[in-house]
């Protein structure tokens, strides 16, 4: 004898609105097996027995959740399979708000996924992205869940809302960010991805007030390493230890950046150095206050700047770009920092 | 000098009401969310509300939650806490705390007012 | 709701003393974590933010290490005023949550 059941998983994910076919099958060698399904809710698929097999039709109604039992018999033997069934519903309804977001300033932003089904945290997750990363420093509120607005009758569809209080975005901004919803269901994983721009201002880059000579720039994981002779330099938020005091790079998406090394005992002097390959430059494309008033050195993939005359690094950005690519990295360095060879 | 001073606190009976509140001084008070942290004689210390600075973000603990409401008049520099339906249990020193933009963290926190819960 | 487990639950030392305490996260918060010192009848006062940062004023014999889960506040030598009780908290997110307390006590 065989007993075979198609799609042989023990439990099958069904997107509302579309139908699915389960066959139960059973050959028999003495005579024809004996196949049904069993533990059917009445508002459960519709079922169509043949000699030796059965079909339960779903037809992918939020009703149709449940986990029938495929029996087949033959002689005195018999078998069985039961099937889980969820019915979802995961459309691509993500809506954001604000529509956009400003540099330079404490807000929050809602992403509002839309007729979802099942409403359960454990199968929802949101994350905020910056490129394919989370977004570090990023605090998640609490979520939200409320009941669709029905037309009709029948089970609810729910709306999942995530809120998120942002760290300042910095200049020059990343041009957005991105929130992701993912539905994980037996077997299958299903994401939508909504962006929310980040609008560029044409102003100088100025960072939003600080109390203190705090890093404060958003970083991904994604973003380049940045090494140091002097005071450490990090963007991988995930690998401590970490400075006490560490101003921060953001580089912008690209296969390979520039790296800022800053280097305290050489009287705040900055190095920037690309290791792309032959023929790759950097030079220093912004510095807080006059570019020119600073003392530059550009050899190739090497670029160095400091200030004139040598004293302590001015509070600011600064940026240093690499061509071919235009890839740039952007270092924050706070004020009040003042050199310390132990650090 | 950045400052927070509670006020309010004393001795009400179970089921009773009680309005806590927070003046702030030193620094642009509209610019911060606000919390209430409270700390249970002998126990630790738990987080109970916040608010946005504009006040259109507010969110409990489930221990208050439909029995206290946070809020805040920005044109005083005053935070509060307007406590209702108040148990045994809400019983514990009750501290305002400042939010640190950006990071999140309560840097600053007033010295706390004392609210008994007994009948 | 993310549980935060300090250990240990209190400790005895001397003045001079090295002194660890360490705090476990139920799930990961990055580094979004900070670190308070409560000494009786006080407000607490923050002494780590964002895991390993050094708030403005606090003795550099305080530090803070860990990311993800596990974290830990070190006292390099311990000086009297430092008998207190220190609390880590996570404000990765809502509700924020806290350890509940190491009392660091005279031997």
């Known amino acids: 004898q065989s007993f075979q059941v198609n799609p042989p998983e023990s439990e099958v994910a069904v997107a509302m609105g579309t139908s699915l076919q389960i066959t139960c099958s059973m050959s028999c060698d003495e005579g024809v097996a004996r196949v049904h399904w069993r533990g059917l809710d009445t508002s459960l698929g519709s079922v169509q027995t043949l000699p030796g097999s059965s079909i339960l039709s779903v037809r992918g109604m939020l009703s149709d959740t449940g986990t029938p039992v495929c029996v087949g018999s033959c002689g005195s033997r018999s078998f069985q399979h039961s099937v889980k069934i969820l019915v979802y519903a995961f459309p691509d309804q993500l809506v954001v708000s604000p529509e956009f977001l400003v540099p330079g300033q404490d807000q929050v932003v809602s992403c509002t996924a839309h007729n979802i089904w099942p409403a359960d945290p454990n199968s929802l997750s949101f994350a905020l992205l910056l490129g394919e990363q989370r977004l570090e420093g990023a605090q998640a509120l609490e979520p939200e869940q409320e009941e669709e607005i029905q037309e009709a009758e029948g089970t609810p569809l729910f709306r999942m809302t995530q809120r998120w209080r942002l760290p300042s975005l910095g200049t020059p901004a990343p041009p957005a960010l991105h929130c992701q919803v993912t539905m994980q269901l037996p077997k299958l994983v299903l994401t939508h991805r909504k962006e929310i721009p980040v609008l560029q201002s044409q102003t100088s880059p100025k960072p939003p007030n600080t109390t203190s000579a705090e890093p404060y720039i958003l970083t991904s994981s994604s973003t380049a390493e940045a090494v140091s002779t002097g005071l450490n330099i990090t963007t991988l938020p995930s690998a401590p230890p970490y400075p006490k005091l560490s101003p921060r790079t953001l580089s912008s998406e690209g296969p390979c950046r520039p790296k800022i090394h800053q280097d305290l005992e050489a009287g705040w002097e900055l190095l920037c150095e690309a290791s792309c390959g032959p023929g790759v430059t950097v030079r220093w494309t912004l510095a807080p206050g006059d570019l020119a008033t600073y003392h530059k050195r550009e050899a190739g993939a090497q670029a160095w700047l400091s200030v004139l005359p040598p004293g302590p690094m001015v509070e600011g950005w600064f940026q240093c770009r690499q061509d071919p690519g235009g890839e740039v990295t952007n270092l924050y360095v706070p004020g009040q920092v003042t050199p310390n060879s132990s650090s | 000098e950045v400052q927070l001073l509670e006020s309010g606190g004393g001795l009400v009976q179970p089921g009773g009401s009680l309005r806590l509140s927070c003046a702030a001084s030193g620094f642009t008070f509209s610019d911060f969310w606000m919390h209430w942290v409270r700390q249970a004689p002998g126990k630790g210390l738990e987080w109970i509300s916040y608010i946005s600075g504009d006040g259109g973000y507010t969110n409990y603990a489930d221990s208050v939650k439909g029995r206290f409401t946070i809020s805040r008049d920005n044109s005083k520099n005053t935070l509060y806490l307007q406590m209702n339906s108040l148990r045994a249990e809400d019983t514990a020193v009750y501290y305002c705390?400042?939010?640190?933009?950006?990071?999140?963290?309560?840097?600053?926190w007033g010295k706390g007012t004392t609210v008994t819960v007994s009948s | 709701d993310i549980q935060m487990t300090q250990s240990p639950s209190s400790l005895s030392a001397s003045v001079g003393d090295r002194v660890t305490i360490t705090c476990r996260a139920s799930?990961?918060?990055?580094?979004?974590l900070a670190w308070y010192q409560q000494k009786p009848g006080k407000a607490p006062k923050l002494l780590i933010y964002a895991a390993s940062s050094l708030q403005s004023g606090v003795p550099s014999r305080f530090s803070g290490s860990g990311s993800g889960t596990d974290f830990t506040l070190t006292i390099s030598s311990l000086q009297p005023e430092d008998f207190a009780t220190y609390y880590c908290?996570?404000?990765?997110?809502?509700?924020?949550?806290f350890g509940q307390g190491t009392k660091v006590e005279i031997k």
């Open positions: 908290q996570q404000y990765k997110s809502y509700p924020v949550t």
């Open positions: 705390a400042r939010d640190r933009p950006y990071y999140y963290y309560m840097d600053v």
């Open positions: 799930q990961s918060v990055s580094r979004s």
